[in-house]
């Protein structure tokens, strides 16, 4: 029994004066608490508690269920205890069958003994099944058997407390261990779509999926830079023991422009937090924005190919697309496709493939697109570069030599004189007159240039060359002269193609 210094309050004393008492079932339990300031006896076993205000606790016929801790407390709050075992061969265990364990923590299988002198107090699997090899325990006859560091793999483990009595194994009622998983990673969060584009009045609905090992994961939808509580609906499922899924759906039944912004789905557990965002853009009406992928003024050589390419944003989806040239609509030679297969894609590509362009096929090519709200168009001005062609080369009545050439870009005409029979004409002759004529063809067609020189300047036999050239190529025409006496004769002009 405790001893204290005189003058200090002391704990009560209990008779019999031992920490543990063993009585047989049916025998009397008589416990006396001696203290001038006696308050009460308390009895505890498992979750049961009883009190007695008499200083002597008497149980006339002890039963196994009277096994437990008897505590006497005085008015100073000081106490003393004795543990009583009521030995009953027919009831070796007191049990509380609820058994929950938190992963990585210890949990108590509550099967205290009524007889501390039995041996091999341990755990056994149900129906002879083996226990996990890594399961470890600490026995305490007064409390039960502590399973150390519960593993997730022990979930739904069926077990018994076991003792040996007279050479035979005796099992308690069965326990089923339910393991509450520990959070060892942040929740996994995903969102149904990363961005939403809506017109005013349309419904905005977005779903966040939260996955974790248990339902005690916390989640919420938040609007960035706002404290307003959002309305969400939940659905949840357990896919097996440690695979929990929750779907949190946020809905705005009639979205307004000022609902635009970033919405965050946030989830956390004891390990940490995770979030994912989605962007809402609400527009008052639909739109189409066109972006040319090449310059809208295009130069292409005669006989070559060119692709006219546009990208465009369209919301709602485009309904009609067409390419037009000279008031005619192309039925083929073009393709239109979405920029990505993403469900929220609003970007599209349209390509017009022009092949082996002729000089006559320059002009304005227009792409038109429309949706339910707007129309939009873009024009490409296509110029076909052509090698000069000499249209006419004549000696006029006034003695002038005239050369008319057409091509694109605008040709330049140079004149050369070749004396005698020389093949190379190097002496250049300055023209008297140069004019750019209006072509009778469509705009973007060939440009016509007329150049004249005075033939009276030539005093010797020879050849005059009219050379028309531009970036694409050159062409020449020749005038041959022969003198008979004082008479100058023009021999028929001829052209030579010079690549």
């Amino acid at each position: 029994q405790p001893s204290v210094s005189p003058g200090e309050p002391s704990p009560p004393s209990i008779h019999p004066g031992k920490s543990d008492l063993i009585v047989r079932v049916g025998d009397e339990i008589r416990l006396l608490c001696t203290d001038p300031g006696f308050v009460k006896w308390t009895f505890e076993i498992l979750d049961e508690t009883n009190e007695n205000k008499q200083n002597e606790w008497i149980t006339e016929k002890a039963e196994a269920t009277n096994t437990g801790k008897y505590t006497c407390t005085n008015k100073h709050g000081l106490s003393n205890s004795i543990y009583v075992f009521v030995r009953d061969p027919a009831k070796l265990f007191l049990v509380d069958r609820s058994l929950y364990g938190k992963e990585d923590n210890d949990t108590l299988v509550r099967c205290p003994l009524t007889d501390p002198e039995v041996t091999n107090y341990s755990l056994k699997g149900c129906q002879g099944k083996p226990l996990p090899k890594d399961l470890r325990f600490i026995p305490d006859p007064k409390a039960g058997i502590m399973i150390k560091s519960v593993k997730r793999a022990y979930h739904r483990l069926c077990l018994h407390c076991s003792v040996d009595q007279e050479g035979k194994s005796v099992l308690s009622e069965k326990f089923i261990l339910k393991v509450r998983p520990a959070f060892k990673a942040v929740p996994v969060v995903s969102v149904s779509k990363a961005s939403y584009l809506l017109r005013e009045g349309e419904e905005f609905t977005v779903t966040c999926t939260i996955k974790d090992v248990s339902s005690s994961v916390y989640s919420t939808w938040k609007r960035e830079n706002s404290q307003t509580k959002l309305q969400e609906k939940y659905n949840s499922w357990h896919h097996g023991d440690f695979n929990y899924e929750r779907q949190a759906t946020l809905t705005i039944s009639s979205a307004r422009v000022n609902d635009s912004g970033v919405f965050m789905c946030y989830a956390n557990n004891t390990f940490g937090s995770a979030n994912v965002t989605t962007t809402l853009e609400v527009v008052d009406k639909g739109f189409i924005n066109i972006f040319p992928m090449i310059n809208t003024t295009v130069f292409v050589n005669d006989g070559e190919n060119v692709d006219l390419i546009v990208e465009y944003e369209a919301f709602p989806k485009p309904e009609h697309q067409q390419w037009i040239y000279m008031n005619r609509t192309f039925t083929d030679k073009w393709e239109d496709y979405p920029k990505s297969e993403n469900e929220s894609n609003i970007r599209y590509v349209s390509e017009l493939h022009l092949t082996r362009l002729k000089g006559t096929e320059g002009g304005t090519y227009t792409f038109l697109v429309s949706n339910s709200d707007v129309n939009a168009a873009i024009a490409f001005n296509v110029y076909v570069n052509t090698k000069p062609e000499i249209l006419t080369y004549d000696r006029l009545v006034n003695g002038m030599l005239q050369c008319v050439a057409a091509g694109f870009p605008e040709p330049t005409i140079d004149w050369y004189f070749c004396p005698g029979t020389e093949q190379r004409c190097s002496a250049s002759v300055l023209p008297v007159d140069v004019q750019t004529l209006n072509s009778s063809g469509p705009p973007f067609g060939k440009l016509v240039v007329q150049s004249s020189i005075d033939s009276s300047a030539f005093k010797h036999n020879g050849t005059v060359e009219c050379k028309a050239y531009n970036d694409v190529g050159k062409t020449s025409a020749y005038f041959n002269f022969a003198f008979k006496g004082n008479n100058k004769e023009q021999i028929h002009p001829h052209t030579l193609f010079t690549p």
Partner: nanobody, 125 residues
Framework: EVQLVESGGGLVRAGGSLRLSCAAS????????RAWFRQAPGKEREFVAA????????YYPNSMKGRFTISRDNAKNTVYLQMNSLKPEDTAVYYC??????????????????WGQGTLVTVSS
């Protein structure tokens, strides 16, 4: 870590008694499970007895029950094995083992972490 030292082994006649001691030092307060195993030449290590340091629960195989008794002295940090009615087949090296807790299969020597060097018990006929 815990260090274990066995003593008390020796030569004894059949029918005689011996008391083995296992003294523990180091971080012994964290080690609740104490056990005795024995190994005869050419045989597997065999479970003899075990005791819970905190709760005083005892463990025996049926073959040893009655002749062998395990006990403890907390003040001396020592576990004892009282062996009575010894037989020649009890001849073996007796080892003391310890761990923080009991394995579910407390008779499986592979599941204990700490071991003494052993003490030889010879029972002559």
């Amino acid at each position: 870590e815990v260090q274990l030292v066995e003593s008390g082994g020796g030569l004894v006649r059949a029918g005689g008694s011996l008391r083995l001691s296992c003294a523990a030092s180091g971080r012994t307060f964290t080690y609740d499970a104490r056990a005795w195993f024995r190994q005869a030449p050419g045989k597997e290590r065999e479970f003899v007895a075990a005791i819970s340091w905190s709760g005083g629960s005892t463990y025996y195989p049926n073959s040893m029950k009655g002749r062998f008794t395990i006990s403890r002295d907390n003040a001396k940090n020592t576990v004892y094995l009282q062996m009575n009615s010894l037989k020649p087949e009890d001849t073996a090296v007796y080892y003391c083992a310890a761990d923080e807790s009991f394995p579910a299969y407390y008779s499986d020597y592979a599941l204990y972490r700490y071991w003494g060097q052993g003490t030889l018990v010879t029972v002559s006929s």
